[in-house]
């Protein structure tokens, strides 16, 4: 029985972090609110303080343990509650039975680097961060390249339908500055979504050799 104007969305990063966003129309900005996590089959529970991210929206990260520790599995169910302080009491403002491996959003890929660059080509690699070993190779990636005079939104998406942590960009223009981003998504989970985009990697193609056709 939580109000229809309230929205409570959480994602598990597959290791030791659940990130939550709660929004409610007409909620008071100065109210102290928390997210409480109560797993159904674990001895621990966890709390984080919701902090405002907009006029009617709050966010927080439940840190369940060391970044690479596997704190939840596919059989876990975690009761997540938004509690807001009213005088002495905490009021339950939102509640959900959260299935972590149905609601996955991994951390953005890291350690992007140029492996090899030519006039028309660039080979780039990256690493995934804090991703569960449960996925084995069941991951996919999307990549995009920012060309001069364009926006990220205009950049065509390149899809890698397997766990491939590198890409060879082709048909690039010589002596041109580009930026590159990649994101990752597990194949598992009904409500799983793409990770945030990685930090952009800037690179420049080599100039065309003098006296040669480009």
């Amino acid at each position: 029985a939580v109000n229809g104007t309230s929205q409570f969305t959480c994602f598990y990063n597959s290791r030791a972090n659940i990130s939550c966003v709660w929004s409610q129309d007409g909620a008071l900005q100065d109210t102290s609110c928390q997210v409480h996590a109560w797993p159904d089959r674990r001895r621990w529970n966890q709390t984080c303080e919701l902090l405002p991210v907009s006029q009617a929206s709050w966010a927080c990260n439940l840190i369940l343990g060391a970044p690479d520790s596997q704190k939840l599995t596919t059989v876990d169910i975690v009761t997540l509650r938004v509690l807001c302080r009213e005088g002495v009491r905490w009021r339950v403002m939102a509640i959900q039975d959260f299935k972590p491996f149905e609601n996955l959003r991994l951390m953005a890929p890291i350690s992007l680097q140029v492996v090899h660059v030519e006039t028309h080509r660039c080979n780039i690699s990256w690493e995934i961060s804090q991703a569960s070993h449960y996925f084995e190779r069941h991951l996919e990636f999307e990549a995009r390249t920012l060309s001069p005079g364009h926006t990220w939104e205009e950049a065509p998406l390149l899809t890698l339908k397997q766990k491939q942590e590198w890409i060879c960009l082709e048909t690039l223009t010589p002596d041109t500055q580009y930026e590159f981003q990649v994101r990752v998504k597990p194949l598992q989970g009904e409500f799983t979504t793409w990770s945030p985009w990685s930090q952009p990697l800037a690179f420049r193609t080599k100039p065309a050799a003098l006296g040669k056709d480009t």
């Epitope: 939580v2 109000n3 409610q24 005088g87 002495v88 009491r89 403002m93």
Partner: antibody, heavy 117, light 112 residues
Framework: QVQLQQWGAGLLKPSETLSLTCAVY????????WSWIRQPPGKGLEWIGE???????NYNPSLKSRVTISVDTSKNQFSLKLSSVTAADTAVYYC???????????WGQGTLVTVSS | DVVMTQSPLSLPVTPGEPASISCRSS???????????VDWYLQKPGQSPQLLIY???NRASGVPDRFSGSGSGTDFTLKISRVEAEDVGVYYC?????????FGQGTKVEIK
């Protein structure tokens, strides 16, 4: 099984301070709200105030200037003090436990406090 | 303060028959989280009150299913589907939405 057991002086003179204590047995003290409620003879119930395990309090505005509720988590006890009592404070005083959803799910046995000169 | 008005104040009942108590509040009790913080308590003769219903319609642990609560906003009802002799006593509604929490004046249920 949660039990609340309360005690304190039952007979007071006007202007004295009422003092009651409630001990909680068989349950956790943190995560709940601990209240005092009173019932004058033959009348209805009045909420006096409540406290949580960390000591935050809510007092009924009608009594706020005279009421102090405190907690001793090491003993799983909480207490009520009501200063400058008059005959109008004669009542059965109850301690109670509350949850996030129910205001008072367990009650003490009640203590009759009579104020008379 | 929120005024809770119960009716009737006295309710003679026949065992096996249904009974109903109404409680009306002077302010809306629907919290912004969608819950009505309304409790119902029974005070049997010579005893402390005991919780019957919380959040308007949820039966407390150990309460027989002949007791049910309903309502939202300002109008709430406690129903006993078939009254038993042990159900006699004073029934109180109480609101926990607006501080200070306040009780109704009580409804005395007695066997005819």
């Amino acid at each position: 099984q949660v039990q609340l057991q309360q005690w304190g002086a039952g007979l007071l003179k006007p202007s004295e301070t009422l003092s009651l204590t409630c001990a909680v047995y068989g349950g956790s003290f943190s995560g709940y709200y601990w209240s005092w409620i009173r019932q004058p003879p033959g009348k209805g119930l009045e909420w006096i105030g409540e406290i949580n395990h960390s000591g935050s309090t809510n007092y009924n505005p009608s009594l706020k200037s005279r009421v102090t509720i405190s907690v001793d988590t090491s003993k799983n006890q909480f207490s009520l003090k009501l200063s400058s009592v008059t005959a109008a404070d004669t009542a059965v005083y109850y301690c109670a436990r509350g949850t996030d959803t129910a205001m008072a799910d367990y009650w003490g046995q009640g203590t009759l406090v009579t104020v008379s000169s | 303060d929120v005024v809770m008005t119960q009716s009737p104040l006295s309710l003679p009942v026949t065992p096996g028959e249904p009974a109903s108590i109404s409680c009306r509040s002077s302010q809306r009790l629907l919290h912004s989280n969608g819950y009505n913080y309304v409790d119902w308590y029974l005070q049997k003769p010579g005893q402390s009150p005991q919780l019957l219903i919380y959040l308007g319609s949820n039966r407390a642990s150990g309460v027989p299913d002949r007791f049910s609560g309903s309502g939202s906003g300002t109008d709430f009802t406690l129903k006993i589907s078939r009254v038993e002799a042990e159900d006699v006593g004073v029934y109180y509604c109480m609101q926990g939405t607006h501080w200070p929490w306040t009780f109704g004046q009580g409804t005395k249920v007695e066997i005819k």
